[in-house]
């Protein structure tokens, strides 16, 4: 997971939309108890912004110690600062908790840049603006870290919501959400609505701003418009999905669809950008450049180095194309597409000497670890992580930033053949999967 700093090929053919629409998700089958409807107490329980992550308030220990915890669908450890650190306002003090149990085991998590290490234990955990339950969960007490905590981010730990396969030190360490589902009646599903600001926020505004919602155990209808469309979770490690086609302003990138998923495609709330494999990134940038050629942007802009600025309120959104990702559908030979606007992939930046202007960073970047659908994508949609049915749902977010001419969209079905061939099979090695 990233914290402004995770053969024989053939094409998946995108076709015209079918005449029929798939049934709306809510019309499908009998409801699971507590599975959907209104979750008022959980709405608006996230804060933060795409550049530094979204966090939820959690309590750990007895008596409860309150901490802000980064919501990360790209990792699987619940890990919290447990020692003083210059970037932490507060940290978990195990010695003050009567319910803490030491597992007498260490954990070390290296990233390409930086690392964290700590000691494993268990304690009682709850989410004040979540389900009214307390669970005993594994906790990695971070005692040492490098380039992990972010100055000014306002979070003190990380909630890895992915599967046990990528948990550290190994898959025997049960992730928080697995513990929650096992120990309570909370359905095995959560959903995220991340709300990008659309304009830069200064530090005091961030602390006061609403970042979105994490609905634990269900789906809240008020957080999306239109229908939810589901894509299968290919494998339960990261939240891995399959992209079958990519379009820029309706123009197919015409790449072998395996390239889009080389070496995987994941949905990761802990990553800021939409990250694309090198070849795909280069093709996408070429296409976005061509579509927006009425203005000449510096090379550094496409790398994320230079910002582009316009006089306040005059950003020419219309010159930038929409980007559509087609995802494998639940029905054979059927896909659907999610479409994001420049309002999602141009990220507003503060701290600039051009304060009379609106300045943006290009938030699509190159990856050597596959496609990462980070906050840039997620801020356009309400995303349902339906673990029980091994699928991820997308609907247009009620809070996404758009203009009067275009809106983010989730549309389907489309006929797409040979979609299984779009998945890349990673050679099995003992190497770490977390070095993103």
């Amino acid at each position: 997971t990233q914290h402004g700093i995770r053969l024989p090929l053939r094409s998946g053919l995108g076709g015209a939309p079918l005449g029929l629409r798939l049934p709306r998700e809510t019309d499908e089958e009998p409801e699971e108890p507590g599975r959907r409807g209104s979750f008022v107490e959980m709405v608006d329980n996230l804060r933060g912004k795409s550049g530094q992550g979204y966090y939820v308030e959690m309590t750990v220990g007895s008596p409860p110690q309150t901490l802000n915890i980064l919501v990360d669908t790209g990792s699987s450890n619940f890990a919290v600062g447990a020692a003083p650190h210059p970037f932490l306002h507060r940290y978990y003090q195990r010695q003050l908790s009567s319910t803490y149990r030491d597992l007498r085991k260490g954990v070390y998590v290296p990233y390409t840049q930086g690392k964290w290490e700590g000691e494993l234990g268990t304690d009682l955990v709850s989410i004040p603006h979540g389900p009214n339950v307390t669970v005993r969960a594994n906790i990695a007490a971070i005692t040492e870290s490098d380039k992990f905590f972010i100055n000014g981010s306002n979070w003190e730990g990380i909630l890895g919501l992915a599967y046990a396969e990528i948990a550290r030190p190994d898959d025997s360490l049960e992730p928080f959400f697995d513990s929650l589902v096992k120990q309570t009646h909370v359905p095995n599903l959560f959903s995220l609505q991340l709300c990008g600001a659309g304009f830069p926020l200064n530090q005091s505004e961030v602390l006061a701003s609403v970042g979105g919602s994490m609905i634990i155990g269900g789906i809240d209808h008020s957080l999306y418009t239109g229908s939810l469309w589901y894509t299968p979770i290919r494998r339960e490690w990261y939240y891995e999905v399959i992209i079958v086609r990519v379009e820029i302003n309706g123009q197919d990138l015409k790449m072998d669809c395996k390239e889009y998923n080389y070496d995987k495609s994941i949905v990761d709330s802990g990553t800021t950008n939409l990250r694309l494999p090198k070849k795909v990134f280069e093709a996408a940038v070429k296409s976005i450049k061509a579509a927006s050629s009425t203005e000449k942007f510096p090379d550094g802009f496409w790398l994320g180095e230079q910002l582009v600025c316009w006089q306040a309120g005059t950003t020419p959104w219309n010159i930038f194309p929409v980007i559509s990702l087609y995802l494998m559908g639940e029905v054979t030979n059927q896909s659907f597409r999610i479409t994001i606007l420049p309002q999602q992939y141009l990220r507003p930046v503060e701290d600039v000497a051009t304060s009379q202007d609106d300045c943006y960073k290009f938030a699509i970047s190159q990856s050597s670890t596959g496609t990462v659908m980070g906050a840039v994508i997620m801020e356009g949609f309400y995303v349902v992580f339906d673990r029980a049915r091994k699928r991820i749902g997308f609907a247009v977010s009620a809070c996404h930033v758009h203009d009067e001419f275009r809106t983010a969209a989730v549309e389907g079905p489309f006929v797409t053949l040979d979609m299984e061939d779009c998945g890349y099979n990673i050679p099995q090695t003992d190497e770490s999967t977390l070095m993103t």
């Epitope: 402004g4 000014g152 090379d299 550094g300």
Partner: antibody
């Protein structure tokens, strides 16, 4: 307030290396790349290269490849430039600068004198 | 590499004058040009970006214009504190390049 702090002077021997620092404050260090610029006495400005602190991706002026190495320490919000195999041609003031559009904030510069 | 040429090394001026410093790019750089002011013994200070936009806090007597290959920095009603060297820079493509500088001097 955005600030880039650089030490004032470095006196070094020919053939050795020097590591210049640039400590950033007043903004989120990983959100902005960091540039390095050379200025020889009484002369113009020469762009050396740039580093992205969030992933250490670098881009160089071909002329400085092999001469300059750019690194960062995000935990201390500090960018570094190491200059190797120093000669009198490397005697100059070296600035770090942060970009938004162009280079909006500059450090005060470190004066490097290469002398035996 | 793109060459940025400031043909006038020195520009004699008096307080109250209006002066124009010119800069020519060897190829089209769009509007991706910045202007900097540097006083003796100091670091450069950013004045103009995107050829014609003033950075925050820069007095409005400084105006930038031009696009493509020809750029101008105009200082209307020159003040004594404006006596300095001025550099143009293109950030359209790597490597970034600077003009050789134009020094404003008292006549």
């Amino acid at each position: 307030e955005v600030q880039l702090q650089q030490p004032g002077t470095e006196l070094v021997r020919p053939g050795t290396s020097v590591k210049l620092s640039c400590k950033a404050s007043g903004y989120t260090f990983t959100n902005f790349w960091m540039h390095w610029v050379k200025q020889r006495p009484g002369q113009g400005l020469e762009w050396i290269g740039v580093i992205n602190p969030s992933d250490t991706y670098t881009k160089f002026n071909q002329k400085f490849r092999g001469k300059a190495t750019l690194t960062v320490d995000t935990s201390s919000s500090t960018a570094y430039m190491q200059l190797s195999s120093l000669t009198s041609e490397d005697s100059a003031v070296y600035f770090c600068a942060r970009p938004t559009v162009g280079l909006d904030y500059w450090g005060q510069g470190t004066s490097v004198t290469v002398s035996s | 590499d793109i060459v940025m040429t400031q043909s006038q090394k020195f520009m004699p001026t008096s307080v109250g004058d209006r002066v124009s410093v010119t800069c020519k790019a060897s190829q089209n750089v769009g509007s991706n040009v910045a202007w900097y002011q540097q006083k003796s013994g100091q670091s450069p200070k950013a004045l103009i970006y995107s050829a014609s936009h003033r950075y925050s806090g820069v007095p409005d007597r400084f105006t930038g214009s031009g696009s493509g290959t020809d750029f101008t920095l105009t200082i209307s009603n020159v003040q004594s504190e404006d006596l300095a060297e001025y550099f143009c820079q293109q950030y359209n493509s790597y490597p970034y390049t600077f003009g050789g500088g134009t020094k404003l001097e008292i006549k």
